[in-house]
Structures are given as structure tokens and as C-alpha cells.
């Protein structure tokens, strides 16, 4: 027993001009998966035979949409190892066959339509227990690196799966019918292929494909206790105990149903019961129907009553991807403004405001001037939590509704006289000053205070700056 | 989803042939459908008339066709045939190809175990 891994590294255009730009069509986006078939033997076999050794399909790859001028990438690839679990002994020479579909997402009628995009075939030799192969294979336009092994389970060793290996912590002594090996005494090998499902405990075999029962133990694969301690047919004792030949193959033995699936014996036949995830016949293909739950997180699922008939997973808010597996990080659309942190609570987004901004998004500016203009030709001004107003010369308050009279803080120094103006205040300086302001006095040898009289007065001129 | 195509259907005298045809889309699951034959006359249930596996080894038949209909397929073709011999008056229907890839089980001829579904071809049988 073991399992023969899949790894697909990349799959793209290949090198050289007229490599394909997207794999998917002019109708819209896409996703790939990938199925992988495995044939026993080196010969070359019609494509639609069975695949005898088993086959696996992947899960369906992130939503491809192709960008326009932007150099053709690698895809989008599904997550995960390719598995596809085999009973008996790995036969070590084998057919691989890759295959690459594209699901198109476009708005078919009858939901997402399947077509063939590249298929590699490779016949190889490989011992079970190795490292990891890679290959690189063109299909066409396209090409794909992958690795793959085989490995073995279930205390299962050797190169072909076939010799049972006894755990550490077992007895020293090998169980009924396991000889031990040399020159390693912490592993058994394992006698010929008994019958498939003989007891491991009751039964033994000393041919191929034979199911001896042990003492007490009667039955096609010694599973049943016998209520006398001898059998009908005896074939003579063994060296163990005394055994019984077995009638005529069922219909289940050798258990045709593969992935775990269950046999039951039907009149000159046999059904199986697939276990979740497994199709056909057989059991022996892999695929994913509503009727699995293949929608995470409370995605609902549509379509898909058969493997045929692609499913689409409808996701609630906060997750994403083709089984609504990912968590959206909904911060990471930044969506609080005006530098406020971003809080993913799960059930809802939180943003927390800076000072001076606020609501559910931060779009608030608690300094904002919109909406409280300043009147009478006040300027707004933000700042500080709270807007204020700028007036006009002759306005003033908060907003600048109040008329207020200029001269009446007295703004023009050393005696000059006020008068209110238009446009603002106008100062008559008294003899000897200058300025806005009447501020800079005028020296009697006639040089300013300024470090430069203003170009067309003569000092002492009555000063009226506006 | 699967697109079914029947083709082959005709008028034909009793005791003549007819062979009718379902072409299927192709999908990682070829091998693995079971392909039913199913009629319905006008006023009629629909009923199973033949079915197989495209895995291999599994045909069925219903009892008023066994020994006149052969159900058979190529598969490089993706196409699933049902050639029908010695055809009567009551063989006179509206022939469906259907397919399902089930979960364990067998290929039986019950309607309500196929999922897609052909747009059906006519075969009328005359005397």
C-alpha cells in the first residue's frame, strides 16, 4: 500500500514566439485544475482507457484574468499536492498522464463550461521509496514542471510497497506467517499476497492469493470463529496450525472498490458505496459535488449535483476563493481614511479616527470649513479641532456677521487720526511720523528711520498708505 | 456541465434498423459516466431502455429490448451509440441520451438517477 505525489511547480507559454498570451478564452476569466491518471506498464495506451493504478483531481485554481500588454505569466495554480493512493504492490514501471483544464467562469448557460487545455503523457520507472522526480513537458504551447514519487504506508517497505515493516515498539517476534528478514531484525518481510482482505490476525497463506485460517477461525477470509475447532476440506495441517481452503472467489474478494470504498455483494455481481469525495463505479476517480460541502466558512453551494456539473461556492462576506477557504483581509483595500487604523473584527470592519476626523470611515474633518462658510468675505481657516474665520477688515466674530468698526482699537500711532475706509482704515500720521500706521518717526536733520524713503516722497510729506 | 447530442433518429418500417447516436462533451470524468438510453411515447412515461458504463463492464438492458438493442460506445470519440434491430411499432418514441457519473452503485435505467440530459431524437416505427 502507498501513495503516488504529485507536485505541479508551474504551468505556462512556453518558450518561443506564438506562445498563447491566456489560457482563457475571449468569454472572461478562468481557473485550471489538473487531473492526474495512472496505467500500469510501459505500453502505450488509448487515452480513454481506465486508469488502473488510480487517478486524482486537483482542487480548482485562483480566478485568472488576463491583463492586457502584460507579459504573459506563469497561472495561477490550485494549492496542494496531486494524491492518489494505490493498495497493492507498485508495479514501478507506469504511465503518467498530466491533464490541464480550464473552467470557464464567462455567463455559460448551465453554469461553468470544461475544456481541455493540455495533456502530457510520460512513461517512466520509478522505485517507491525515492526522492522526488522532476520533469518539465511541452504540450503544445504550453509547458509544465512538475515532481512526483511514490512513496510507501502502512508499515509497507521496499521498492514495491510489498514488504511489511514491524514498528520499533513491536515485539521482537514477527506475527502468524511473517518471516524475519536478514539481515534486519526490525523488519518482516512479508510472505506471498495473500488474499485480499484475509485476516491479519485468524489468517494466513503459504501460496499466492490463498487465505489459510487459524485455529478456531473459519470463514472466506478467516473472519468468522468457527464453533469446532477443525474445518471441512482440509488440505492437511500447517506448520503453524490447521487450515482451511477457501470456496471460490466472491464478487468482492480482492475488494474491487478502490479509495476505501465499501463492497457489497450483489446476485452474480457487486455494488460499491464511495466514501465522500469519490466517484464512479468503482470508486475510482476523485471529484467534488455540492453534496461534499466543498463551501467553507458558510459559502453556499450552487450547481453541481454530479462531478460533471461544476459547483460555484457564493461566499458570505469577509472570506473569498473558489471554496470560500480564504479570510478577505478587507483592511488591506485600506479602506479608513485620512490615516485611520484599520480594525478587521470579523463580522465587521471598525476604523479608529484620528483627532479631528471621524465617521464610519474617517471621511469626517471635524475641521472642515464646508458647510460653515464665513461671511462678509471671511476666509476659513482649519486648524486646532475647530474652524475659524478670518474677517475682512470691518468684520468680525466667529463667523463674521458682526460689523465692527476699525478705528475703534485705535490703530494709528503717535496721534495720527482714523478713518474707516472701504477697503480697511486710512491713518493721517501727525507732523513727523510715517507709515500705515503713523508708526516710524520722521528726524528733523530730514533722514528716515526707514532704511530707505519710498520713491517719490520727500520727507515730511502727511503719509496716507492705504 | 455536460452537452449531450442525439442524432440518428428516423421513420423506419417494422423489422428494419436504426442507430442512434450520443455525442458527450468531454471532461476529466469521461471515463467515468454512466450513459442511459431512455424513450418516450406520446401519452407515455419515460422509461429506460439501456445503459452503460464508460469505465467498461457494465451494460444493462430493459426487458422489452434485450436480444434487439446493443448499447456500445468510443471512446475516442466521447460517443455512446444504441443500435436498435427488428424495431416494432411500440419502439416508436422520442429516444434521450442521458448521463450521470455516479458514486459507487451501478448504471440502471432509472430516470432519476441521471443528471444531463439530451434534447432527445425521433424514431417512429411504421407498418
Known amino acids: 500500500a502507498g501513495v503516488f505525489e504529485l507536485q505541479i511547480h508551474s504551468f505556462g507559454p512556453g518558450p518561443g514566439p506564438g506562445a498563447p498570451r491566456s489560457p482563457c478564452s475571449a468569454r472572461g476569466p478562468c481557473r485550471l485544475f489538473f487531473r492526474v491518471c495512472l496505467k500500469p506498464g510501459l505500453s502505450e495506451e488509448a487515452a480513454e482507457s481506465p486508469c488502473a493504478l488510480g487517478a486524482a483531481l486537483s482542487a480548482r485554481g485562483p480566478v485568472y484574468t488576463e491583463q492586457p500588454e502584460a507579459p504573459a505569466p506563469d497561472l495561477p495554480l490550485p494549492n496542494g499536492l496531486l494524491q492518489v493512493p494505490f493498495r497493492d504492490a507498485w508495479p514501478g514501471t507506469f504511465s503518467l498522464i498530466i491533464e490541464t483544464w480550464r473552467e470557464e467562469l464567462g455567463d455559460q448557460i448551465g453554469g461553468p463550461a470544461w475544456s481541455l487545455l493540455a495533456r502530457v503523457t510520460r512513461r517512466r520507472r520509478l522505485a517507491a521509496g525515492g526522492p522526488w522526480a522532476r520533469d518539465i513537458q511541452r504540450a503544445g504551447a504550453w509547458e509544465l514542471r512538475f515532481s512526483y514519487r511514490a512513496r510507501c504506508e502502512l508499515l509497507a517497505v521496499g521498492t514495491a510497497c510489498t514488504r511489511l515493516c514491524r514498528p520499533r515498539s513491536a515485539p521482537s517476534r514477527c506475527g502468524p506467517g511473517l518471516r524475519p528478514c536478514a539481515p534486519l531484525e526490525d523488519e518482516c518481510e512479508a510472505p506471498p499476497v495473500c488474499r485480499a482482505g484475509c485476516s491479519l490476525e485468524h489468517g494466513f497463506c503459504e501460496q499466492p492469493g490463498e487465505c489459510r485460517c487459524l485455529e478456531g477461525w473459519t470463514g472466506p477470509l478467516c473472519t468468522v470463529p468457527a464453533s469446532t475447532s477443525s474445518c471441512l476440506g482440509l488440505r492437511g495441517p500447517s506448520s503453524a496450525t490447521t487450515g482451511c481452503l477457501v470456496p471460490g472467489p466472491g464478487p468482492c474478494d480482492g475488494n474491487p472498490c478502490a479509495n476505501g470504498g465499501s463492497c457489497s455483494e450483489t446476485p452474480g455481481s457487486f455494488e460499491c458505496t464511495c466514501p465522500r469525495g469519490f466517484y464512479g463505479l468503482r470508486c475510482e476517480v476523485s471529484g467534488v459535488t455540492c453534496a461534499d460541502g466543498p463551501c467553507f466558512n458558510g459559502g453556499l453551494c450552487v450547481g453541481g449535483a454530479d462531478p460533471d456539473s461544476a459547483y460555484i461556492c457564493h461566499c458570505p462576506p469577509g472570506f473569498q476563493g473558489s471554496n470560500c477557504e480564504k479570510r478577505v483581509d478587507r483592511c488591506s483595500l485600506q479602506p479608513c481614511r485620512n490615516g485611520g487604523l484599520c480594525l478587521d473584527l470579523g463580522h465587521a470592519l471598525r476604523c479608529r479616527c484620528r483627532a479631528g476626523f471621524a465617521g464610519p470611515r474617517c471621511e469626517h474633518n471635524l475641521d472642515d470649513c464646508a458647510g460653515r462658510a464665513c461671511a462678509n468675505g471671511g476666509t476659513c481657516v482649519e486648524g486646532g479641532g475647530a474652524h475659524r474665520c478670518s474677517c475682512a477688515l470691518g468684520f468680525g466674530g466667529r463667523d463674521c456677521r458682526e460689523r465692527a468698526d476699525p478705528c475703534a482699537a485705535r490703530p494709528c500711532a503717535h496721534g495720527g487720526r482714523c478713518y474707516a475706509h472701504f477697503s480697511g482704515l486710512v491713518c493721517a500720521c501727525a507732523p513727523g511720523y510715517m507709515g500705515s500706521r503713523c508708526e516710524f518717526p520722521v528726524h528733523p536733520d530730514g533722514v528716515s528711520a526707514l532704511p530707505a524713503a519710498p520713491p517719490g516722497l520727500r520727507p515730511g510729506d502727511p503719509q496716507r498708505y492705504l | 456541465q455536460v452537452r449531450l447530442v442525439e442524432s440518428g433518429g428516423g421513420s423506419v418500417q417494422v423489422g428494419g434498423s436504426l442507430r442512434l447516436s450520443c455525442a458527450a462533451s468531454?471532461?476529466?470524468?469521461?471515463?467515468?459516466?454512466?450513459m442511459g438510453w431512455f424513450r418516450q411515447a406520446p401519452g407515455k412515461e419515460r422509461e429506460g431502455v439501456a445503459a452503460?458504463?464508460?469505465?467498461?463492464?457494465?451494460?444493462s438492458y430493459a426487458d422489452s429490448v434485450k436480444g434487439r438493442f446493443t448499447i456500445s460506445q468510443d471512446n475516442a470519440k466521447n460517443t455512446v451509440y444504441l443500435q436498435m434491430n427488428s424495431l416494432k411499432p411500440e419502439d416508436t418514441a422520442m429516444y434521450y441520451c442521458?448521463?450521470?457519473?455516479?458514486?459507487?452503485?451501478?448504471?440502471?435505467?432509472?430516470?432519476?438517477?441521471?443528471?444531463?440530459w439530451g434534447q432527445g431524437t425521433q424514431v417512429t416505427v411504421s407498418s
Open positions: 468531454r471532461s476529466p470524468y469521461s471515463s467515468s459516466r454512466c
Open positions: 442521458a448521463a450521470v457519473v455516479p458514486r459507487g452503485g451501478s448504471c440502471r435505467l432509472d430516470e432519476r438517477g441521471y443528471y444531463h
Open positions: 452503460l458504463y464508460t469505465g467498461g463492464g457494465s451494460t
